[in-house]
C-alpha cells in the first residue's frame, strides 16, 4: 500500500549490523508523486566500489546510488548526510554485508517522503502538446484558443472535421490557410454529390505546401483523398506532387489532412466540381454506337447496333440492337449484352437430299446441300451452296432462303438393257434395266413411273379398277418377290377425257386416247430399281420416225407362258400405221374394219416376232432422248394389237403431254410443291 513517508533502518540499528545480511525495502508512494530519500546516519564498512558492504538505491532498472563508509552532515542545521530525489513513485533500497567486518559498523538510518513532481518540467518528454499545468500529485494539459484537447487529455488539435460539401462546385483549404496549419490535427472533409456525378479535384502546385516526407519517404504531415475503394495520396512536400486534376470516378470523396506536432507550413487550397459521371467508350466488338461521341457521361443513352451478321441474344430472343444508358456508377447498363455472330442454326433437311453437318452454323459459315445422286438432282438450281446470312437464314445466291429441291432423275436405268431374245421374241430383263416399270396385279398389266407421285398407264388398264394395287422395284412378280418390293397405293385415277367408256370393254374396237394417270398417296423413294422415265418434249425432235427403236418391257404373255414371272423386254422399231392395219386381228370381237386407227397411236414391231402382248398393257415404249442419249422417254404406252408377235399399237404420249402436265399441276399437293 503506497505511503507518503517512512523510515528505513539497517538491521540491529543502532547496534552493529550482522555479517552476511542482504535485506531490501520496496518503497512506494502514491501516483503523481516522486520520492525524496535521505540518510541521517551512514556507518558501513568502506571498500572500493562498496564491494564488501553497501546500501544500494534502485529506481526501476537504474541504480540511483550505492553507499558505504561514514558520512557526516555538511550543514550544521541539517542531519542529512546523503539524499536522493527521484520523479518516480517507486524505489528499492538493498542492504548487503559480507562475511566479516574488521570493525563494528552501526549501519544506516534513512527516511523517505512523497514529494510533488513537476511533470511539465521534470521530464525530457513534454507531456502536453501545448500548455502544461502542474499541481501537487499531478498535472493537466490545456490548449490555446480555437484548439481543443483530444481524448488522450494531452494533445490539442483544431476542430476542423465534420464539414460536408454537397454543392456541385466548391473550394476547400487547410485551417488558417495561407497561414501555417495547426499541428497535431486530423482534418476530415466530406464531399457528397448527387449520384451520377463524379468529384473532380483541381489543385495548383503553388497552392500546396505541407511538411516534407522523412528520409524513408513517409509523409509527416499528409493530404489523402479517398473515393470508395480508391485512394489518392498521401501527398506532402513543397508544391503539389500529384495530378493537378483528379477524376475520382465517385460522387463521394473524403479528404483527410493529418499533421504532427512539428513543422507547420502554409498548407493547401483546392477546388472541386461535380462532373457528370463518365462512362468509358467501350470497345464492343461487331457493333456501332449511335450517337458517336468522344466522351459519354451520366444519363447519356446510346443505341448499340450490331454489324450485319451479328445479333444480341437475350434469353431466346435475338435482336440487332439494344440501348445502353450511362449510369450513376459510371458503368453502362446492359453491359452484359454483346453482339454475337448470328447463328443460323442446324440447316433444315431436305427430301431426297442431305446437308453435311456444318463445322459452324455462325454468320459466314457455308453449307452444301446435295441430292441423293444418281437418283435425284437439284431442280431449282443454285448449286446447293448456302451461307449463313446476317438475318440468321441460310441463303443461296440464286434461291435466297428457299431450300433446294431434289427431284428424281428420269430415264436413266442403272444397268443398260442388252437385247436378248424373249417377251414375244424378247428376252429376260432386270428391273434395273427398266426402273420405271410398274406392275399392276389386277388386271395383270404394266405402267410407267413418271415422278414421285404419278404413274402413267393405259386407260384400259384402270377403267375397270380405279384402286389398282401397283408394285415397283422387283424383277420378278411372285408373291414373295412382290412382298419384298415397294407397293404403291393409289390416291386417284385420272382417265383421259377422250377415252370412251364401254359397258362391255371386251368388245372394244376403239383404243383412241388410251392413257391414264394414277396419283399416288405417298411419294416413291427412288433408287437403283425404282426411278422414273422422262416425258417427251413438245418440240419436233420428239416426233418419231419409222425405224426409230424403242424398248418395251413387262410381265405379259410370252411364247411359253400366259404371264411372265420375271420381267421381259424387247427392242422394236417404229413402223408405219398401215403395217398394223394390215395384220389380221387374231380373235376379232368385231368386224376388222371396226378397229379404229388414229394419229394418237404408234405402230411398232414386226421384227423377229418381237412384240408386246396381253399383260404388258400400260408399260412404256421407251425411246432414247434425242437431246440426251443417256436418257429414255416414254414415247408410247402399250395399248392394243391385232396379233401378238406381229405389230403392236402404242398410245402416242407426245400428244398428251399438255394433258399430263395440267392434270399433275392441278392435283399436286403442297408437299410436292
Amino acid at each position: 500500500e503506497p505511503t507518503m513517508y517512512g523510515e528505513i533502518l539497517s538491521p540491529n540499528y543502532p547496534q552493529a549490523y550482522p555479517s552476511e545480511v542482504e535485506k531490501s525495502w520496496d518503497i512506494e508512494v502514491p501516483e503523481g508523486y516522486g520520492i525524496h530519500l535521505y540518510f541521517t546516519h551512514l556507518d558501513i564498512e568502506l571498500s572500493e566500489n562498496c564491494a564488501y558492504d553497501s546500501v544500494q538505491i534502485i529506481s526501476g532498472d537504474t541504480e540511483e546510488g550505492r553507499l558505504c563508509g561514514q558520512r557526516s552532515s555538511n550543514n550544521p542545521h541539517s542531519p542529512i548526510v546523503e539524499e536522493f530525489q527521484v520523479p518516480y513513485n517507486k524505489l528499492q533500497v538493498i542492504f548487503k554485508s559480507d562475511f566479516s567486518n574488521e570493525e563494528r559498523f552501526t549501519g544506516f538510518a534513512a527516511y523517505y517522503v512523497a514529494t510533488d513532481i513537476n511533470e511539465c518540467t521534470d521530464f525530457v518528454d513534454v507531456p502536453c502538446s501545448h500548455f502544461c499545468n502542474n499541481f501537487i500529485g499531478g498535472y493537466f494539459c490545456s490548449c490555446p484558443p480555437e484548439y481543443f484537447l483530444h481524448d488522450d487529455m494531452k494533445n490539442c488539435g483544431v476542430n476542423c472535421s465534420g464539414d460536408v460539401f454537397t454543392a456541385l462546385i466548391g473550394e476547400i483549404a487547410s485551417p488558417n490557410y495561407p497561414k501555417p496549419y495547426p499541428e497535431n490535427s486530423r482534418c476530415e472533409y466530406q464531399i457528397r454529390l448527387e449520384k451520377g456525378f463524379q468529384v473532380v479535384v483541381t489543385l495548383r502546385r503553388e497552392d500546396f505546401d505541407v511538411e516534407a516526407a522523412d528520409s524513408a519517404g513517409n509523409c509527416l504531415d499528409s493530404l489523402v483523398f479517398v473515393a470508395g475503394d480508391r485512394q489518392f495520396g498521401p501527398y506532402c512536400g513543397h508544391g503539389f506532387p500529384g495530378p493537378l486534376n483528379i477524376e475520382t470516378k465517385s460522387n463521394a470523396l473524403d479528404i483527410i489532412f493529418q499533421t504532427d506536432l512539428t513543422g507547420q507550413k502554409k498548407g493547401w487550397k483546392l477546388r472541386y466540381h461535380g462532373d457528370p459521371m463518365p462512362c468509358p467508350k467501350e470497345d464492343t466488338p461487331n457493333s456501332v454506337w449511335e450517337p458517336a461521341k468522344a466522351k459519354y457521361v451520366f444519363r447519356d443513352v446510346v443505341q448499340i447496333t450490331c454489324l450485319d451478321g451479328f445479333e444480341v441474344v437475350e434469353g431466346r430472343v435475338g435482336a440487332t440492337s439494344f440501348y445502353s444508358t450511362c449510369q450513376s456508377n459510371g458503368k453502362w447498363s446492359n453491359s452484359k449484352l454483346k453482339c454475337q455472330p448470328v447463328d443460323c442454326g442446324i440447316p433444315e433437311s431436305i427430301e431426297n437430299g442431305k446437308v453435311e453437318d456444318p463445322e459452324s452454323t455462325l454468320f459466314g459459315s457455308v453449307i452444301r446441300y446435295t441430292c441423293e445422286e444418281p437418283y435425284y438432282y437439284m431442280e431449282n438450281g443454285g448449286g446447293g451452296e448456302y451461307h449463313c446470312a446476317g438475318n440468321g437464314s441460310w441463303v443461296n445466291e440464286v434461291l435466297g432462303p428457299e431450300l433446294p429441291k431434289c427431284v428424281p432423275v428420269c430415264g436413266v436405268p442403272r444397268e443398260p438393257f442388252e437385247e436378248k431374245q424373249r417377251i414375244i421374241g424378247g428376252s429376260d430383263a432386270d428391273i434395273k434395266n427398266f426402273p420405271w416399270q410398274v406392275f399392276f396385279d389386277n388386271p395383270w398389266a404394266g405402267g410407267a413411273l413418271i415422278n414421285e407421285y404419278w404413274v402413267l398407264t393405259a386407260a384400259h388398264v384402270v377403267e375397270g379398277n380405279r384402286e389398282p394395287t401397283m408394285y415397283v422395284g422387283s424383277t420378278s412378280v411372285q408373291t414373295s418377290r412382290l412382298a419384298k418390293s415397294k407397293m404403291l397405293t393409289p390416291e386417284h385415277v385420272f382417265i383421259h377425257p377422250g377415252w370412251k367408256l364401254l359397258e362391255v370393254p371386251e368388245g372394244r374396237t376403239n383404243f383412241d386416247n388410251d392413257i391414264a394417270l394414277v396419283r399416288l398417296k405417298d411419294p416413291v423413294k427412288m433408287g437403283p430399281t425404282v426411278s422414273p422415265i422422262c416425258l417427251p418434249g413438245t418440240s419436233s425432235d420428239y416426233n418419231l420416225m419409222d425405224g426409230d427403236l424403242g424398248l418395251i418391257s413387262g410381265w405379259g404373255r410370252t411364247e411359253k407362258r400366259d404371264r411372265a414371272v420375271r420381267l421381259k423386254a424387247a427392242r422394236l422399231p417404229v413402223a408405219p400405221l398401215r403395217k398394223c392395219k394390215e395384220v389380221k386381228v387374231e380373235k376379232p370381237t368385231a368386224d376388222a374394219e371396226a378397229y379404229v386407227f388414229t394419229p394418237n397411236m404408234i405402230c411398232a414391231g414386226g421384227e423377229k416376232g418381237m412384240d408386246s402382248c396381253k399383260g404388258d398393257s400400260g408399260g412404256a415404249f421407251a425411246v432414247q432422248d434425242p437431246n440426251d442419249k443417256t436418257k429414255f422417254y416414254a414415247a408410247g404406252l402399250v395399248s392394243w394389237g391385232p396379233q401378238c408377235g406381229t405389230y403392236g399399237l402404242y398410245t402416242r404420249v407426245k400428244n398428251y403431254v399438255d394433258w399430263i402436265m395440267k392434270t399433275m399441276q392441278e392435283n399436286s399437293t403442297p408437299r410436292e410443291d
Epitope: 442388252e418 424373249r422 429376260d428 434395273k432 424383277t475 408373291t479 414373295s480 414371272v565
Partner: antibody
C-alpha cells in the same frame, strides 16, 4: 448345241477352299440367269446359288451364305463358285444350270464332284 | 423357307401303268412349280414348268397339275425309259427348294 461343263472339283480338307468353274457354249451366255445346284451322294437336289445376267443380283441358300460366292464373266462365257470354309456336309456333285426363263432349268452340266474330308 | 414334301419316296409300277407323284408345299406357291427327271448318273432334265406346261420335246405322256399347295405329276403310261428319280421344285421364293425326290422303278 447348248453345253455346260463344270470343273474345279476334287478332294479338300475341312476349312479349305475350292473354286468351281462352268464353261458355257452353244448359246449367248449373257442372255441367261445361271445357278449352281448340288447333290450329295445318294441324296436329292439342293439349290445353292443364283446370279442375274449382269451379275448384279445374287441369291444364296442359307447353308452356304457367307462362305460361297457366285460370279460370272460374260466375256469368257464362264460361271464361277468360290467355296471357302468348306465342311464335310458340302461334299456333293455340283451342277451349273441355265435358267431357261422364269426359274426353270432347261440345261444342266454333267457335274463336278467336291469331296470335303480330312 | 418353303418346304416341299414329295410322295411317295419310291414306287414300283409296270410298263403301261399310270403313275402319280404328289408334291405338297408348306405355303401357297401359286403355280410356281417345275418337275424334273434325273436318270442314274445323269444331270436332271426339265419336264414341266409352271405346274402344268410341258417343256418342248418332252413326251405328252408326262403331265402336271395343281395350284397353291398341292401338285400332281402324272405319267399316263409308264415306259421302260421312264425309270428315274423325279423332283418337284418351287420358285415362289428364295431359296429355291426341291422336293425329296420319288424313285420310279419297273416291276
Amino acid at each position: 448345241e447348248v453345253q455346260l461343263v463344270e470343273s474345279g472339283g476334287g478332294l479338300v480338307k475341312p476349312g479349305g477352299s475350292l473354286r468351281l468353274s462352268c464353261a458355257a457354249s452353244g448359246f449367248t451366255f449373257s442372255d441367261y440367269y445361271m445357278s449352281w445346284i448340288r447333290q450329295a451322294p445318294g441324296k436329292g437336289l439342293e439349290w445353292v446359288s443364283y446370279i442375274s445376267r449382269s451379275g448384279s443380283t445374287k441369291y444364296y441358300a442359307d447353308s452356304v451364305k457367307g462362305r460361297f460366292t457366285i460370279s460370272r464373266d460374260n466375256a469368257k462365257n464362264s460361271l464361277y463358285l468360290q467355296m471357302n470354309s468348306l465342311r464335310a456336309e458340302d461334299t456333293a456333285v455340283y451342277y451349273c444350270a441355265r435358267d431357261e426363263t422364269d426359274y426353270a432349268y432347261d440345261n444342266w452340266g454333267q457335274g463336278t464332284l467336291v469331296t470335303v474330308s480330312s | 423357307d418353303i418346304q416341299m414334301t414329295q410322295s411317295p419316296s419310291s414306287l414300283s409300277a409296270s410298263v403301261g401303268d399310270r403313275v402319280t407323284i404328289t408334291c405338297q408345299a408348306s405355303q401357297d406357291i401359286s403355280n410356281y412349280l417345275n418337275w424334273y427327271q434325273q436318270k442314274p448318273g445323269k444331270a436332271p432334265k426339265l419336264l414341266i414348268y409352271d405346274a402344268s406346261n410341258l417343256e418342248t420335246g418332252v413326251p405328252s405322256r408326262f403331265s402336271g397339275s395343281g395350284s397353291g399347295t398341292d401338285f400332281t405329276f402324272t405319267i399316263s403310261s409308264l415306259q421302260p425309259e421312264d425309270i428315274a428319280t423325279y423332283y418337284c421344285q418351287q420358285y415362289e421364293d428364295y431359296p429355291l427348294v426341291f422336293g425329296g425326290g420319288t424313285k420310279v422303278e419297273i416291276k
